[in-house]
Amino acid sequence: IVLRPSRVHNSEENTMRALTLKDILNGTFSYKTFFPNWISGQEYLHQSADNNIVLYNIETGQSYTILSNRTMKSVNASNYGLSPDRQFVYLESDYSKLWRYSYTATYYIYDLSNGEFVRGNELPRPIQYLCWSPVGSKLAYVYQNNIYLKQRPGDPPFQITFNGRENKIFNGIPDWVYEEEMLATKYALWWSPNGKFLAYAEFNDTDIPVIAYSYYGDEQYPRTINIPYPKAGAKNPVVRIFIIDTTYPAYVGPQEVPVPAMIASSDYYFSWLTWVTDERVCLQWLKRVQNVSVLSICDFREDWQTWDCPKTQEHIEESRTGWAGGFFVSTPVFSYDAISYYKIFSDKDGYKHIHYIKDTVENAIQITSGKWEAINIFRVTQDSLFYSSNEFEEYPGRRNIYRISIGSYPPSKKCVTCHLRKERCQYYTASFSDYAKYYALVCYGPGIPISTLHDGRTDQEIKILEENKELENALKNIQLPKEEIKKLEVDEITLWYKMILPPQFDRSKKYPLLIQVYGGPCSQSVRSVFAVNWISYLASKEGMVIALVDGRGTAFQGDKLLYAVYRKLGVYEVEDQITAVRKFIEMGFIDEKRIAIWGWSYGGYVSSLALASGTGLFKCGIAVAPVSSWEYYASVYTERFMGLPTKDDNLEHYKNSTVMARAEYFRNVDYLLIHGTADDNVHFQNSAQIAKALVNAQVDFQAMWYSDQNHGLSGLSTNHLYTHMTHFLKQCFSLSD
């Protein structure tokens, strides 16, 4: 399936040019998406090109400036948040990034009724997290690891927690491991639907070992960064969940929510909190050995002012073939009766599907089924359930949006997106207004991305929100590579791959091949999305063939493929990349003397192991910020897939699966090892240990470190990185500069 047909006729060929590395580094061909900031069923806010915050009313078709760019600029605001009663806006400035999601900022409150900033009882700075209540204009915020509450922006704050301490106790915000590996948010507090209660997590990191690394900066002495970071098998954070009545916060104070007995009997995690009503809350817990998850529905007891979680409202989800859930355990979407819910989990055939749970998980009613997977439930209304899946035409790397009518029996299913712009759009997400009155569809490709607005009742397209016309025009004279997504059938395993081919690709010629790999559990690289990136350049200008392969351990193709890597990381992922390369060679257009592999993070681990596989297939390869031993990586992530590094559990495979154990095998390949010294995620330690093992084995290799850079290698480091890797590959493939 050629997704980007060549638009070129010979007569036009002279005006066409190849992509340059500069194009990629400058972001010349980046695209825009449009996600409405919904504030009601028919209204949304959006920041205009000139930085005004504009309200759009879909029904009237009219726009209104609610906050001028001058007001934004007066405090150098980079973000904003409207209070639900529309009386105030918070303006966020002095953004300072911490980890993947977390950052601190300064917040100003602007009064929309008088057009002035709120003076008196101003917020402290910097704030770690701030949010409005879902109704009215109460404020909850986290400052110095403690939670504060304001009934109105101008009021003095009420301090909810007092034990917060840097790197020790975190209230309302996650510690490092919960942020990165469990919650995937910067916050750990949740308002009840009408703002009556505020739930929050407390993380106690007192006993967690600390990772320490130097931050060189500009001073005479480097700083030491200390992060409580539990590596595999180490002591984990202790989590507790509390709920406070925000109307009378001083009355009984925060009340702890009990942990289900079957969870509390050994080490455990809190995985998510979902409010159902103002007086009903749903908590999800997970055993440290992550194959048992418990969903617990708790009710407020007015007489005792406590939260009660009856055993009859505990729902257990267990995996016998792997870990619970996909990457995370899915969260429930409650229906209007406030007790039954919809949830995605594996069916009896091992495919993740939507189930409706009314009383017990055992009696769950399966809503979707087939040899494909339901991926996300977007919205449940009185009569419809909107979800995404990769069902259409059996391409796992696609995403379409479906509507199931739950108001009628039997429920009927309709694909909302499958035939909208079939060639251009095969990978969608959606954003819904209140009660799904309207929704935005964001199409990511394979063609140029486009965002559209739709009527939630009829699915009719109302207008185009963003169609990337400038990008389309800019690409008219660019020789883009061709892309195809196909599959290989090998030993009862389906290996989907994406191949990126040079613009004038000729099957009778031989091309150098670069494998780009990630390959982590529950990931997917072969997706029908648009991208003009470094590998596009390598195909367009340098004439390389690039391939991405989804092997065992990857997602959305059923549990057999997903859980194949359980307790055995570093084996099948590598095998499947090698198998695919052999198949590509058989296709006849690959120069088997010029094959390389590269990857970042988990991909750096896989590329390193592939290079050290001893197959002789790879001439060279690059590992950026690789994991080198699972003993060095975070407990929550690592143990999910590997169990514990103990003798009576899985220590043997922890030891066997290191990159260092294969140091000798790097002798016959050209290896480029790259890492940021301030990587809080995959610590520089990983590459330091690879380098040490290679030196000890007297194996020559190339390396590059990026001082004070984290796992993302951003800013000027990005330019240096891709320039450096380009030179390395061109040299490896004997391509002239």
């Epitope: 009601s40 069923g41 028919q42 205009s48 005004n52 504009v54 309200l55 029904e59 009237t60 078709g61 009219q62 726009s63 209104y64 400036t65 609610i66 001028s68 001058r70 409207l82 639900p84 009663d85 529309r86 929309l112 009724s113 057009g115 109704v135 209140d434 009660y435």
Partner: antibody
């Protein structure tokens, strides 16, 4: 101080047209929409329409479509309303009002322009 | 169009007492938790002045003796304590749906 200064009274013949001006001061014209309202003698108020100054986008009361046309001149911070094909029914006081979109409220009003249609 | 019916048409209240004006909409003007009902005061020869917006929020410089309440289709304006300066016409107005419409007005005077 927010001020909406409207043009003076008009006496016109049936079938004629009239253009009422509304000069905004004390705030930036493009920060708020401008709405127009009419009040016939001894009667209640009727909403005519709304204009978004940044793009000139308008919405009208169906009743006034073809009767009223709203425009903006950003350079002079002035909003205009054209009324055409006037009849005695159009005799009224016409107000321009600053419209605070986030609250859907007309928070400041001009002093009004009296239009009398008589032969 | 949404029709707003005000009652009473006229009202006389003693100084210091409470004045209550009602406004009933022909259909709900609730919008996802908010009600876009506004109240205006108009004195002879003057333009209307915004008193209350969004059902219950006082406009700029409006004294605390003016308050608004209601939801769905039934809304009211309360003035307490009544002062001499409050003699005027009062209009309710909805901006939940185009065309925005006004009530017929209530004439408030001192008893």
């Amino acid at each position: 101080e927010v001020l909406l200064q409207q043009s003076g009274p008009e006496l016109v013949k049936p079938g004629a047209s009239v253009k009422i001006a509304c000069k905004a001061s004390g705030y930036t014209l493009t920060d708020y929409n401008m709405d127009w309202v009419r009040q016939s003698h001894g009667k209640s108020l009727e909403w005519i329409g709304d204009i978004y100054p940044n793009t000139g986008g308008t919405i009208y009361n169906q009743k006034f479509k073809g009767k009223a046309t709203l425009t903006i001149d950003k350079s002079s911070s002035t909003a205009y309303m054209d009324l055409r094909s006037l009849t005695s029914e159009d005799t009224a006081v016409y107000y321009c009002t600053r419209f605070r979109g986030i609250h859907y409220a007309m928070d400041y009003w001009g002093q009004g322009t009296s239009v009398t249609v008589s032969s | 169009d949404i029709v707003l019916t005000q009652s009473p048409v006229s009202l006389a209240v003693s100084l210091g007492q409470r004045a209550t004006i009602s406004c009933r909409a022909s259909e709900s003007v609730d919008n996802y938790g908010l009600s876009f009902i506004n109240w205006f005061q108009q004195k002879p020869g003057q333009p209307p002045k915004l008193l209350i917006y969004g059902t219950s929020n006082r406009g700029s410089g409006v004294p605390a003796r003016f308050s608004g309440s209601g939801s769905g289709t039934d809304f009211s304006l309360n003035i307490h304590p009544m002062e001499e300066d409050d003699t005027a016409m009062y209009f309710c107005q909805q901006s939940n749906e185009v065309p925005y419409t006004f009530g017929g007005g209530t004439n408030l005077e001192i008893k």
